[in-house]
């Protein structure tokens, strides 16, 4: 299972993808939106 995280500490597992929080403006991924620090880095 994949991991979704918010900076606020929330996480769930869902689908075969990886999402987690990075500093906004990081060049490591795409901002998901409507989250706290949610960035796609897979």
């Amino acid at each position: 299972d994949a991991e979704f995280r918010h900076d606020s500490g929330y996480e769930v597992h869902h689908q075969k993808l990886v999402f987690f929080a990075e500093d906004v403006g990081s060049n490591k991924g795409a901002i998901i939106g409507l989250m706290v620090g949610g960035v796609v880095i897979a």
Partner: antibody, heavy 121, light 111 residues
Framework: QVQLVQSGAEVKKPGASVKVSCKAS????????IHWVRQAPGQGLEWMGF????????NYNQKFKGRVTMTRDTSTSTVYMELSSLRSEDTAVYYC??????????????WGQGTLVTVSS | DIVMTQSPDSLAVSLGERATINCRAS??????????LNWYQQKPGQPPKLLIY???KQGTGVPDRFSGSGSGTDFTLTISSLQAEDVAVYYC?????????FGGGTKVEIK
């Protein structure tokens, strides 16, 4: 300024596929995920999923059970949403959208103008 | 999946009066003191527009007459003094979990 410009209206027969495009401009394309939301005539909003232009990774609403595919072309800053095995209930306006995160100090949303897809025999 | 339920389905309010729309989630959309609950306004023939995010924070350029409140599973959007340009359909949406989900919408009209 940020703009999302979608392709034009489509009429499809049941069982066919449709591919809607969303061309982004006014920002660094790979920085934000692009979401797709649809709205059947006179009905509410339904989130279909999103794709990351940075990596091409997508996350879909499982309601669509493998019928939806979201892709991107970084050379043209365009995201595509393809929906297959169309049925009459897929008749809707399809929107692409981009959202800021809560912690960016400002939170804005940007939407395409919508693409009407009509499924009719 | 989280189910969002709005009430009422429609609402007629006199100009200058208060309009109140309710939204209930089938489970909490809170985490660590943040409510992942957003409100949108949609006018006919237009895409939605984000009004309120994180339950209480105004989106960019949103007039002060729009405010949001609530936490956990119960939320409210208030228009403090209805203007003619506020005639629209309003939707709540949760962004705590995928799939994101919307309420069914509330149509606001002038009485």
């Amino acid at each position: 300024q940020v703009q999302l410009v979608q392709s034009g209206a489509e009429v499809k027969k049941p069982g066919a596929s449709v591919k809607v495009s969303c061309k982004a401009s006014g920002y660094t394309f790979t920085t934000y995920a692009i979401h797709w939301v649809r709205q059947a005539p006179g009905q509410g909003l339904e989130w279909m999923g999103f794709t990351s232009p940075y990596s091409g990774v997508s996350n879909y609403n499982q309601k669509f059970k493998g019928r939806v595919t979201m892709t991107r072309d970084t050379s043209t800053s365009t995201v595509y949403m393809e929906l297959s095995s169309l049925r009459s209930e897929d008749t809707a306006v399809y929107y692409c959208a981009r959202f800021d995160n809560y912690d960016q100090g400002y939170v804005r949303d940007y939407w395409g103008q919508g693409t009407l897809v009509t499924v009719s025999s | 999946d989280i189910v969002m339920t709005q009430s009422p389905d429609s609402l007629a309010v006199s100009l200058g009066e208060r309009a109140t729309i309710n939204c209930r989630a089938s489970e909490s959309v809170d985490n660590d003191r943040i409510s992942f609950l957003n409100w949108y306004q949609q006018k006919p023939g237009q895409p939605p527009k984000l009004l309120i995010y994180a339950a209480t924070k105004q989106g960019t350029g949103v007039p002060d007459r729009f405010s949001g409140s609530g936490s956990g599973t119960d939320f409210t959007l208030t228009i403090s003094s209805l203007q003619a340009e506020d005639v629209a359909v309003y939707y709540c949406q949760q962004s705590k979990e995928f799939p994101w989900s919307f309420g069914g919408g509330t149509k606001v009209e002038i009485k």
